[in-house]
Interface confidence: low
């Protein structure tokens, strides 16, 4: 196993609908052609997985389908977007990457990014 | 004291789905990694793949087209499909508990197994 | 995949001996690799992890050592409840692999 390098925003603020996007970029020591990427919170010093996809470089990201995450991949880097997001979630969110396939196995885990999550106001005489 | 029991038919066909469940008493399945072990008769383990609790998973290349695991949390419960039997999947059966660290900080080793569900590959 | 060869692949010891146990993985694996114990008919267990570290509860005879491609298990003074199979695994890469066993026997 070696150690990679992976880049990540210090401070994301999640929008008033719960959703927070960043990048997450990695320098691939090779050409890999499989990839996983997990994102992990770290809240009160625990660390709980929040979602994990598997790619092949080149093809889109495929997390579950009633996963909070939805990701887009190019090249060295992924676009991560997160979703349904109350103040309760606001964290440090990180970002593991591993090159899974050719050998060797590389890994990689990001110093996170603290998402800030702020539930909005309830509008007066909104019907939603 | 978590518990790991794992049941399921003892006989499949070749060519069938095999389908053994584990349940989870004295303790949550959640924020836990759950892998599947199996062991040949005589012979030694082999990590089929895990799966978290929120439902991602991780699967051994060599039998990564043919299983599947997932997790029913509501019950406490995790299985696994593996498809297209032959005799070569005759085995021991296990599931094991991973501490949920291992992703990040560290990883504790499998410290809670199931005594195993045996399946015969058999006509 | 990463390989890991345990020797012997048989032992017989007695009650009170030192015995030690070998795994070499195929490639390096830093200090990721954990050992268990496993009896006829019973779970495996988890002995030790990270190399060297002692699972909770395991008695002080066991200790573990090594990084890198070369591990041991070893065993201070045998006891008779001692006598089991012993699994070396690596959790560097997936995915995970086990050695072949040390089955260990009463002389």
């Known amino acids: 196993c070696k150690a990679m390098h992976v880049a990540q925003p210090a401070v994301v603020l999640a929008s008033s609908r719960g959703i927070a996007s960043f990048v997450c970029e990695y320098a691939s020591p090779g050409k890999a052609t499989e990839v996983r990427v997990t994102v992990l919170r770290q809240a009160d010093s625990q660390v709980t997985e929040v979602c994990a996809a598997t790619y092949m470089m080149g093809n889109e990201l495929t997390f579950l389908d009633d996963s909070i995450c939805t990701g887009t991949s190019s090249g060295n880097q992924v676009n991560l977007t997160i979703q349904g997001l109350r103040a309760m979630d606001t964290g440090l969110y990180i970002c593991k990457v591993e090159l899974m396939y050719p050998p060797p196995y590389y890994l990689g885990i990001g110093n996170g990014t603290q998402i800030y999550v702020i539930d909005p106001e309830p509008c007066p005489d909104s019907d939603f | 004291e978590v518990q790991l029991v794992e049941s399921g038919p003892g006989l499949v066909k070749p060519s069938e789905t095999l389908s053994p469940t584990c349940t989870v008493s004295?303790?949550?399945?959640?924020?836990?990694?759950w892998s599947w072990i199996r062991q040949p008769p005589g012979k030694g383990l082999e990590w089929i793949g895990y799966?978290?609790?929120?439902?991602?998973?991780n699967y051994n290349p060599s039998l990564k087209s043919r299983v599947t695991i997932s997790v029913d949390t509501s019950k406490n419960q995790l299985s696994l499909k593996l498809s297209s039997v032959t005799a070569a999947d005759t085995a021991l059966y296990h599931c094991?508990?991973?501490?949920?660290?291992?992703?990040?900080?560290?990883?504790?080793?499998?410290?809670?197994w199931g005594q195993g569900t045996t399946v015969t590959v058999s006509s | 995949d990463i390989q890991l060869t345990q020797s012997p692949s048989f032992l017989s010891a007695s009650v009170g001996d030192r015995v030690t146990i070998t795994c070499r993985a195929s490639?390096?694996?830093?200090?990721?690799l954990a050992w268990y114990q496993q009896k006829p008919g019973k779970a495996p267990k988890l002995l030790i992890y990270?190399?060297?570290t002692l699972q909770s509860g395991v008695p002080s005879r066991f200790s573990g050592s090594g990084s890198g491609t070369d591990f041991t298990l070893t065993i201070s003074s045998l006891q008779p409840e001692d006598f089991a199979t012993y699994y070396c695994?690596?959790?560097?890469?997936?995915?995970?692999?086990f050695g072949q066993g040390t089955k260990l026997e009463i002389k």
């Open positions: 094991a508990r991973e501490d949920n660290w291992r992703n990040y900080y560290y990883y504790y080793g499998m410290d809670v």
């Open positions: 004295g303790g949550s399945i959640s924020s836990y990694y």
């Open positions: 799966i978290y609790y929120s439902g991602s998973t």
């Open positions: 490639q390096g694996i830093r200090s990721y």
């Open positions: 990270a190399a060297s």
């Open positions: 695994q690596q959790y560097n890469s997936y995915p995970y692999t």
